[in-house]
């Protein structure tokens, strides 16, 4: 969603849903700024390339990064 | 299951206000954006305004934009819309609409609607 | 803002016919379309989103297509609780997030 003049936050609604890791196409997360005062995630998705906002506080979403990090570290030298 | 209940329609006077609420019941209200959306007597459909789930982002119609608020109160599950400067044109019947949680916006469960009938 | 015209503005239909009606964006949208029912003196009813998905609990009898600025919902077989006022939505990623004129659908 668009930013509006005086905020730039982006999610308009955060999804709680689980998503799988294989599914993803990208992983965006956006710390907080003096333009937006909390962390946002923005996944997009192979299938379509459809974006979803993510619920930060979700169990599901913190295994998400969990496991994203983990594959991250585990092909980087 | 997911409800919306829309209420604080009425008949008021042009230049007037009034403020219209959702009570929301059955989802995790705070993850969820909400709109309001209008339709006058006989017309089609009008999107008036968005909030964020947080309440931070909020966007209008040009048609309401400086004169109609949007506010949320996610302790107690309800979202508002606060109408000034009522003109005749603002005559409707007001749904409150949950978003879909997509990045594109469509609204998935509606309100009932309550009527704003402005005449002098 | 994306203007979506609907046609034709009524449809006089028989129970058991098919119905076809057409929604055309004034530029693209993909295939971000929604369509939605209204029945008298009720709110509207998603119906399909993202041009051809059904929503929640709607019948296999509703079925959308289309991308780009074409977009058609069909109903197979008309039941009677189907003749109502269809509008049509564009889920563009910013506002205003606009709706068609409606098209209604009568019995003949």
């Known amino acids: 969603i668009p930013l509006s003049r005086t905020v730039r936050c982006t999610c308009i609604s955060i999804s709680n849903q689980p998503v799988n890791p294989r599914s993803l196409e990208k992983l965006e997360i956006i710390p907080p700024s003096q333009f937006c005062p909390h962390v946002e995630i923005i996944a997009t998705m192979k299938k379509k390339g459809e974006k979803r906002c993510l619920n930060p506080e979700s169990k599901a979403i913190k295994n998400l990064l969990k496991a994203v990090s983990k594959e991250r570290s585990k092909r980087s030298p | 299951q997911v409800q919306l209940v829309d209420s604080g329609g009425g008949v008021v006077q042009p230049g007037r206000s009034l403020r219209l609420s959702c009570a929301a019941s059955?989802?995790?209200?705070?993850?969820?954006?909400m709109h309001w959306v209008r339709q006058a007597p006989g017309k089609g459909l009008e999107w008036v305004a968005v909030i964020s789930y947080d309440g931070i982002i909020k966007h209008y119609a040009d048609s309401v934009k400086g004169r109609f608020t949007i506010t949320r109160d996610n302790s107690k599950n309800m979202v508002h819309l606060q109408m000034n400067s009522l003109r005749a044109e603002d005559t409707a019947v007001y749904y409150c609409?949950?978003?879909?949680?997509?990045?594109?916006?469509?609204?998935?469960?509606w309100g009932q609607g309550t009527l704003v009938t402005v005449s002098s | 803002e994306i203007v979506l015209t609907q046609s034709p503005a009524t449809l006089s239909l028989s129970p058991g016919e098919r119905a076809t009606l057409s929604c055309r964006a004034s530029?693209?949208?993909?295939?971000?379309v929604a369509w939605y029912q209204q029945k008298p003196g009720q709110a509207p009813r998603l119906l399909i989103y993202d041009a051809s998905n059904r929503a929640t609990g709607i019948p296999a009898r509703f079925s959308g297509s289309g991308s780009g600025t074409d977009f058609t919902l069909t109903i197979s077989s008309l039941e009677p609780e189907d003749f109502a006022i269809y509008y049509c939505q564009q889920r563009s990623n910013s506002p205003p997030w606009t709706f068609g004129q409606g098209t209604k659908v009568e019995i003949k």
């Open positions: 059955g989802f995790t209200f705070n993850t969820y954006g």
């Open positions: 609409a949950r978003d879909s949680s997509s990045w594109y916006v469509y609204f998935d469960y």
């Open positions: 530029q693209s949208v993909s295939s971000y």
